[in-house]
C-alpha cells in the first residue's frame, strides 16, 4: 500500500478509508503544489487512470465517485498535470479499505484436551470481513464473577492455570472491527464436563486362521479417565459405507476388538472416544489399514447380516460417505442394530 | 510483561470534554492491540474502543463521533478525546493491552464523573 507517500497536498475518503462494502464513495484530491497551476487533476485505482465520474470543484480540488464500491482493497493516488511539466506529478495517495461488520460468532465450542493444560475455545466467524477483525474470548467465573479476556484471531487456547478458581464459567467471543461489533452466545462450560481423553491410536490387528477366520484389532489410549465411550468405524478400502461398533472402554489395558470381515479385503479401521455420558468426542484415529487373509472355502458374505459377527456389549450401525471427495464426513443414512441402542447420530468428523 | 497508568479522569459538566491517556511500560507494548473500556458502577466492563489496525479504529455505538482514540508510539502512551460528554458516560474507565492469546492486562482505571 501507499503508506509512506511524500504528498504535495491532500487526499481524503467519504465517508473514511475503510468503509462498508456496497456503500458509494467520494475520494477527494487537493494538491497543494509549488509553482504549478494544473491544468487536469488526475485519479488513480491500483495504478490504472480512471475516466469517469470526475468532478474539478475548483482550482485546487477534484473529486471521484465510486457507487457502490465493492473492492476489498484499493490503492488510489492522484497526480496534477502542470504546464511545462512532461510528467504528471503526484498530490498524493492513499489505501481505501472496504469490508463488513462482523457476523455474531456461532457455534462456540470450548474443550480440554487430556494432558494438555488448555481450555481450547473455537467457533464460527461467520462471512468473511474483509478487513482486519479481532476476537476477544471473555471467561467469567460463575463462582467468583472473576473475568478474563483473551484476544484472538480465529481460536483460542487459555491456560488451565489460569482457570484454577472455580470449575464453573461463563464463556462468550465478541468481534469486534471499525464497522461494528457483535456477541457470541454465551456457553455455560464445566471444567469437568469438557475434557476429551487423550488420543486412542490402533496399534494393530490380526487376522486368525480359524474355520472362521476373525481379526482382532488393538487399540489403546493413554487416558486416566476411568469411564469411556468408543465407536471404531471401519470399512473395505472400496466401499463407501462404513459400520461402526460402540464399546465401553477401561483403558487400563490395551483393547482388543473382534471383528468378522469378509476376507482377501483391505479395510480401513478408525477410532474415536469421549468420556462416558459427555458430549465431545475425540477426532477420528489416523486411518490404520488391514488386509484381511484369502479364504479356501468362498461364500457371499455380507458383513451387517452375517451371523457370525461377534455381538459383545457394541452395537453397529451403517453411515455412508456423502461423497468420495470428502470422506470425513459422515451422514447417518440406516442403522441395523444387532445390540442394545443406535449408535450415537454424531458421525460428523470433528478432527 | 506491560505496565498501564492512565491519568486524565475527573469531573465535567454535560457537554464538556475530557482527554484520557495511558502510558504503557514494558518490553510487549509493540505487539499490544491496545483498547479503551469502561465500567459503570453495577455493569459489565465494556469496550468504548479499540485500535484494529493501522488506521482502522473501533468505536461503541454510544460514543461514535464523540469520542477519539489516538495514539503516540514515540511515547508508548494511548489518548482518548472525550467531547460532548453525557451522564451516561460516568464510569471507571481503563485502557488494555491485549495480544493474541494471552490474557489482557489492564491499567488501574480513572474515574470519569459528569453530572447534568
Known amino acids: 500500500g501507499i503508506t509512506s507517500i511524500n504528498c504535495s497536498g491532500d487526499m481524503w475518503v467519504e465517508p473514511g478509508e475503510i468503509f462498508q462494502m456496497g456503500m458509494n464513495v467520494s475520494i477527494y484530491c487537493q494538491e497543494a503544489l509549488k509553482h504549478c497551476r494544473p491544468r487536469n487533476l488526475y485519479f488513480y485505482k491500483n495504478g490504472f487512470k480512471e475516466e469517469f465520474d470526475i468532478t474539478r470543484i475548483n482550482r485546487t480540488t477534484a473529486r471521484i465517485w465510486y457507487k457502490g464500491f465493492s473492492e476489498p482493497h484499493a490503492y488510489m493516488h492522484c497526480t496534477a498535470e502542470c504546464p511545462g511539466h512532461f510528467q504528471e506529478t503526484l498530490i498524493c495517495g492513499k489505501d481505501i479499505s472496504s469490508g463488513h461488520p462482523p457476523d455474531a460468532p456461532s457455534n462456540l465450542t470450548c474443550v480440554i484436551y487430556e494432558y494438555s493444560g488448555n481450555m481450547t475455545c473455537t467457533w464460527n466467524t461467520g462471512k468473511p470481513t474483509y478487513i482486519d477483525t479481532k476476537y476477544i474470548v471473555h471467561v467469567k467465573s460463575l463462582e467468583t464473577e472473576e473475568e478474563q479476556q483473551y484476544l484472538a484471531s480465529s481460536y483460542v487456547k487459555i491456560s488451565t492455570d489460569s482457570l484454577q478458581g472455580s470449575r464453573k464459567y461463563l464463556v462468550w467471543v465478541q468481534a469486534v472491527n471499525s464497522l461494528g461489533m457483535e456477541n457470541s452466545q454465551q456457553l455455560h462450560v464445566h471444567l469437568d464436563d469438557i475434557v476429551i481423553p487423550s488420543a486412542s491410536i490402533i496399534s494393530r490387528a490380526e487376522t486368525t486362521n480359524d474355520t472362521v477366520p476373525k481379526t482382532i484389532v488393538y487399540w489403546k489410549s493413554k487416558t486416566m479417565i476411568e469411564k469411556v465411550f468408543c465407536e471404531m468405524r471401519y470399512k473395505t478400502t472400496t466401499n463407501q459405507t462404513w459400520s461402526v461398533k460402540e464399546f465401553d472402554a477401561n483403558f487400563t489395558y490395551v483393547q482388543q476388538s473382534e471383528f468378522y470381515l469378509e476376507p482377501d479385503s483391505k479395510y480401513v479401521f478408525q477410532v474415536r472416544c469421549q468420556e462416558t455420558g459427555k458430549r465431545n468426542w475425540q477426532p477420528w484415529s489416523s486411518p490404520f489399514v488391514h488386509q484381511t487373509s484369502q479364504e479356501t472355502g468362498k461364500r457371499n458374505w455380507q458383513p451387517w447380516s452375517s451371523p457370525f459377527v461377534h455381538q459383545t456389549s457394541q452395537t453397529v450401525s451403517q453411515v455412508t460417505a456423502k461423497s468420495s471427495h470428502e470422506p470425513q464426513k459422515m451422514e447417518m443414512l440406516s442403522a441395523t442394530i444387532f445390540r442394545g441402542h443406535p449408535a450415537s447420530g454424531n458421525h460428523q468428523d470433528i478432527g | 510483561q506491560v505496565q498501564l497508568q492512565e491519568s486524565g479522569g475527573g469531573s465535567v459538566q454535560a457537554g464538556g470534554s475530557l482527554r484520557l491517556s495511558c502510558a504503557a511500560s514494558?518490553?510487549?507494548?509493540?505487539?499490544?492491540?491496545m483498547g479503551w473500556y469502561r465500567q459503570a458502577p453495577g455493569k459489565e466492563r465494556e469496550l468504548v474502543s479499540m485500535?484494529?489496525?493501522?488506521?482502522?479504529?473501533f468505536y461503541a455505538d454510544s460514543v461514535k463521533g464523540r469520542f477519539t482514540f489516538s495514539q503516540e508510539n514515540a511515547k508508548s502512551t494511548v489518548y482518548l478525546q472525550m467531547n460532548s460528554l453525557k451522564p451516561e458516560d460516568t464510569a471507571m474507565y481503563y485502557c488494555?493491552?491485549?495480544?493474541?492469546?494471552?490474557?489482557?492486562?489492564w491499567g488501574q482505571g480513572t474515574q470519569v464523573t459528569v453530572s447534568s
Open positions: 514494558g518490553y510487549t507494548y509493540s505487539s499490544c492491540t
Open positions: 488494555g493491552c491485549a495480544t493474541l492469546g494471552s490474557r489482557t492486562v
Open positions: 485500535l484494529i489496525s493501522d488506521g482502522s479504529t
